[in-house]
């Protein structure tokens, strides 16, 4: 593998400056795989460089990258999904950096979208549900999702549940009555694919309503 | 060209340790998962676990959890692979292996021959 | 753990000839058109080889009358010529879930 220092003592002779990092979407527009890479330093002058992937392609040894700002971004059917990829920040088409990546190990998931509350008095319960467009994937299609809620004026203390389905029960007792809450949710892959978060769904806000006593019974 | 060799063949008593290397060579030695992959005299393949040099992570067959420790040392490129407890079934030829991909074996060592003898 | 049937346990076949082994799943070890599958030979004394990598890409450097197909829990190996070199044992293993196991083995010989 050219390009590569052949022990250990160099294998790290990089040049850190060009640090960067990836993450992959795949079925992110129809069959269409998504690959998008930045610098980990957003001072990195980019003027002049270049990202290009190569290897665990079909049909094309390598693909290069559109710039779109200050990301680097690839659009394509043609990843193989299986084995290595070698990705490279290129100028003048010498290397700079390379990092060797499998693309099933960085994927980010799309966020969940259609987040809602809804309360169930009967039940003394909030129902709620979410949508996430991984449903209808091929690849990427079990998920772990993280539902953050916090009430309001608590700016930092979000209480958290994991869960692998669209559809979470949250019981009235366990929440501040006559209380604004805040929920989000986010989404991670959960098997056989690996990789990072995704972003959070948009906030929704619901208000609980406040105690109902029953007829004798006193405040406490 | 990428090579990984193993340490030499080792003789054990029931009840004790053995600790093979294995040294990575001709390439980037942190780009690579190194596994390791059992197989008992005239039987099969068996995964017994492998290791992500970069992190340290580790992955092990639950069948060797708790008898099996994998390290690996980036300034001379080795992995190890250290099985404790032995018994008479663990002899067999220990293969260390890189992964290409998740998780397949591209390169494979000479393999190191484990008897374990009282 | 995924259990992988290999069949025949052995194959006598003559030169030039074809063959063919298969390899059966307990479960799916495929993810859409991802098929986590690998085919490997091993000659007696040596460490096996890396033929086939995802059911059907050739590693490289391997001989192209060696072939793989299939999908979801059944998977074939094929040597579409069969040469005196190709006299081995040849393990299907897969890489889905933990722990990647590999199936018993195919004796390839000459008739």
């Known amino acids: 593998e050219s390009g590569y220092a052949q022990n250990g003592d160099l294998e790290d002779a990089e040049l850190d400056d060009y640090s960067f990092s990836c993450y992959s979407q795949l079925e992110v527009n129809g069959s269409q795989h998504s690959l998008t890479c930045a610098f980990e330093d957003p001072d990195v002058n980019t003027t002049n460089l270049e990202f290009e992937i190569c290897g665990a392609l079909v049909e094309v040894k390598c693909l290069s990258f559109r710039k779109l700002q200050e990301i680097y971004f690839i659009e394509t059917k043609k990843f193989l999904l299986i084995g290595k990829s070698n990705i490279c920040v290129k100028v003048g088409g010498k290397s700079l950096t390379c990092k060797k990546i499998d693309l099933t190990t960085i994927v980010k998931p799309e966020a969940p979208f259609d987040l809602s509350v809804i309360y169930r008095e009967g039940a003394n319960d909030f129902v709620v549900t979410f949508n996430t467009s991984h449903l209808q994937k091929k690849y990427v299609k079990v998920l772990m999702h993280d539902v953050a809620y916090r009430q309001e004026k608590d700016e930092n203390k979000w209480m958290h549940v994991n869960l692998s389905s669209t559809k979470l029960t949250l019981l009235q007792r366990n929440l501040q009555p006559e209380a604004m809450y805040e929920i989000k949710v986010r989404s991670i892959p959960d098997h056989y694919f690996k990789g990072f978060w995704s972003e959070w769904s948009p906030s929704y806000y619901f208000r609980t309503p406040e105690i109902n006593n029953s007829p004798g019974e006193m405040d406490p | 060209q990428v090579q990984l060799v193993q340490s030499g063949a080792e003789v054990k008593k029931p009840g004790a340790s053995v600790k093979v290397s294995c040294k990575a060579s001709g390439y980037r030695f942190t780009d690579y998962e190194l596994h390791w992959v059992k197989q008992a005299p005239g039987q099969g393949l068996e995964w017994i676990g492998g290791?992500?040099?970069?992190?340290?992570?580790?992955a092990y067959n639950q069948k060797f959890k708790g008898r099996v420790t994998m390290t690996s040392d980036r300034s001379t490129s080795t992995v190890y692979m250290e099985l404790s407890s032995l018994r008479s079934e663990d002899t067999a030829v220990y293969y260390c292996a890189r992964s290409g991909g998740r998780w397949y074996f591209d390169v494979w060592g000479q393999g190191t021959t484990v008897t374990v003898s009282s | 753990d995924i259990v992988m049937t290999q069949s025949p346990d052995s194959l006598a076949v003559s030169l030039g000839e074809r063959a063919t082994i298969n390899c059966r799943t307990s479960?799916?070890?495929?993810?859409?058109?991802?098929?986590?599958m690998h085919w490997y030979q091993q000659k007696p004394g040596q460490p096996p080889k890396l033929l086939i990598y995802g059911a059907s890409n050739l590693e490289s450097g391997v001989p192209d009358r060696f072939s793989g197909s299939g999908s979801g829990t059944d998977f074939t190996l094929t040597i579409s010529s069969l040469q005196a070199e190709d006299v081995a044992v040849y393990y299907c293993?897969?890489?889905?879930?933990?722990?990647?196991?590999f199936g018993g083995g195919t004796k390839v010989e000459i008739k």
């Open positions: 293993q897969q890489s889905i879930k933990d722990p990647y196991t």
């Open positions: 479960e799916s070890v495929s993810i859409h058109l991802l098929h986590l």
């Open positions: 290791i992500d040099p970069k992190t340290g992570g580790t």
